[in-house]
């Protein structure tokens, strides 16, 4: 997250970290069910671990943390590497979470976002770009949903209805390492960090997010079919 600020503790209990061994964070994810996460399809790895209820980026033990294995990762069948459409994936955890103040699911919004809607994006991704500098703790940033026209103007021929753009002033954006993490609007999950320009936070080049309102049926059916 570029030019965000430290999230208040316990305010993002749905935020998950996807880790490669030993403890290398490579993507964010979101708890949407007691045993299921959503993340970006481009974050798919065969071997990874899931950390929930953790505030700092470092692997130091925190009393609220819960660690999991992913037993199934189900990318949306319409995703196409290295493209950006349908960039979402469900991950089934090896057991159900223990609900606490630090670990709790969030509902996926069935309403599509309208321009001007205020949202919050979070993650442990780099805080500088093109340089790489990772934060000590989870970062939060207020962003506004842009109109689809502004989004298409920013990225001609690259935007479809499975995506939406959001940003703030130049210099504020999600970035590498935030992928798969949550965009929360009006208390529900509206999007996932998907892609954007490089370097991040350039003027008139907003972040692009997976438009989850288009996938509520797929999410529900996939969880039901695999539970």
């Amino acid at each position: 997250i570029i030019n965000g600020s430290d999230c208040d503790m316990h305010t993002q209990p749905w935020q998950a970290a996807l880790l490669l061994r030993p403890n290398q964070l490579y993507c964010g994810a979101v708890l949407v069910h007691p045993q299921w996460l959503l993340t970006a399809a481009h974050c798919r790895k065969k071997v990874f671990r899931v950390r929930l209820g953790h505030y700092s980026l470092s692997p130091v033990y925190e009393s609220g943390q819960q660690m999991f294995q992913g037993v199934k990762s189900i990318p949306h069948p319409g995703y196409s590497h290295p493209g950006h459409s349908n960039d979402l994936m469900l991950i089934k955890l090896n057991r159900r979470i223990r609900p606490t103040k630090d670990v709790r699911p969030i509902n996926v919004s069935s309403h599509c976002p309208s321009a001007g809607t205020k949202c919050l994006v979070s993650g442990w991704g780099t805080t500088k770009s093109p340089q790489v500098h990772f934060p000590k703790v989870l970062q939060c940033l207020n962003i506004s949903v842009l109109s689809q026209k502004r989004c298409e103007d920013a990225y001609p021929r690259q935007i479809d209805d499975t995506m939406f753009c959001a940003g703030d002033k130049a210099g504020r954006d999600s970035c590498q390492g935030d992928s798969g993490g949550p965009v929360v609007c009006n208390g529900s999950l509206q999007g996932l960090v998907s892609w954007g320009d490089y370097p991040c936070a350039r003027p008139n080049r907003p972040g692009v997010y997976t438009n989850l309102c288009k996938f509520t049926k797929w999410i529900q059916e996939t969880i039901q079919a695999n539970s």
């Epitope: 798919r44 995703y79 590497h81």
Partner: antibody, heavy 117, light 110 residues
């Protein structure tokens, strides 16, 4: 050097159990998923199953109930057991490492197992 | 059940030819497809993963494309060392799968 080496008896009697081990060197099993694949003489590749560092195991549907895949991280080895074998199980058996992006990037040289009395 | 079908099962070509092998999945596997080359008596070798990403050390004459259900492996200019059997493998799911591999395509000298 990253290497995989399968070993085990080359001959197994019908209705017996085929047991193979795959010795892993040059990388820790804790970081990778491992696969077993077989190839009957003159035929194509058949996936048998995968084992993950967390000991989660996926088996091919034909192998469920007959195949057991396990690993010993302290010895850095993966094992395959196939019970109630018939002549149709005669094949070259390979272990392979997944590159973490769903491609098998390191393979053992394979070991031929013949099922015959 | 996800099934992988390769075509053709064999083909004859000459050095310098452009060769195309196709792999079709019975359901969408998104981009989780790998291609392997196998020579007689040897273990398979990874050529391409994620449908189009070239594995380390693989010559650039090999390329992969496709997503969903239809995939292609192309050898832009066939070399003598490329005469071998080629297999595709899906990595989308392991649930209720008989085989993740396609049936293979043998590339022979014309």
């Amino acid at each position: 050097e990253v290497q995989l080496q399968e070993s085990g008896p080359g001959l197994v009697k019908p209705s017996g159990t085929l047991s193979l081990t795959c010795a892993v060197s040059g990388f820790p099993l804790s970081n990778y998923a491992m696969s077993w694949v077989r190839q009957p003489p003159g035929k194509g590749l058949e996936w048998i199953g995968d084992i993950y560092p967390s000991d989660i195991i996926d088996y091919a549907s034909w192998a469920k109930g007959r195949v057991t895949i396990s690993q010993d991280s302290s010895k850095n080895q993966v094992s395959l057991k196939l019970s109630s074998v018939t002549a149709a199980d005669t094949a070259v058996y390979y272990c392979a490492r997944d590159n973490n992006d769903y491609g098998l990037d390191i393979w053992g040289q394979g070991t031929l197992v013949t099922v015959s009395s | 059940a996800y099934q992988m079908t390769q075509s053709p099962s064999s083909l004859s070509a000459s050095v310098g030819d452009r060769v195309t092998i196709t792999c079709q999945a019975s359901q969408s596997i998104s981009s989780w497809l790998a291609w392997y080359q196998q020579k007689p008596g040897k273990a398979p070798k990874l050529l391409i993963y994620l449908a189009s990403t070239l594995a380390s050390g693989v010559p650039s004459r090999f390329s992969g494309s496709g997503s969903g259900t239809d995939f292609t492996l192309t050898i832009s200019s066939l070399q003598p060392e490329d005469f071998a059997t080629y297999y595709c493998q899906q990595g989308y799911t392991n649930s209720n799968i008989i085989n993740t591999f396609g049936g293979g395509t043998k590339v022979e000298i014309k």
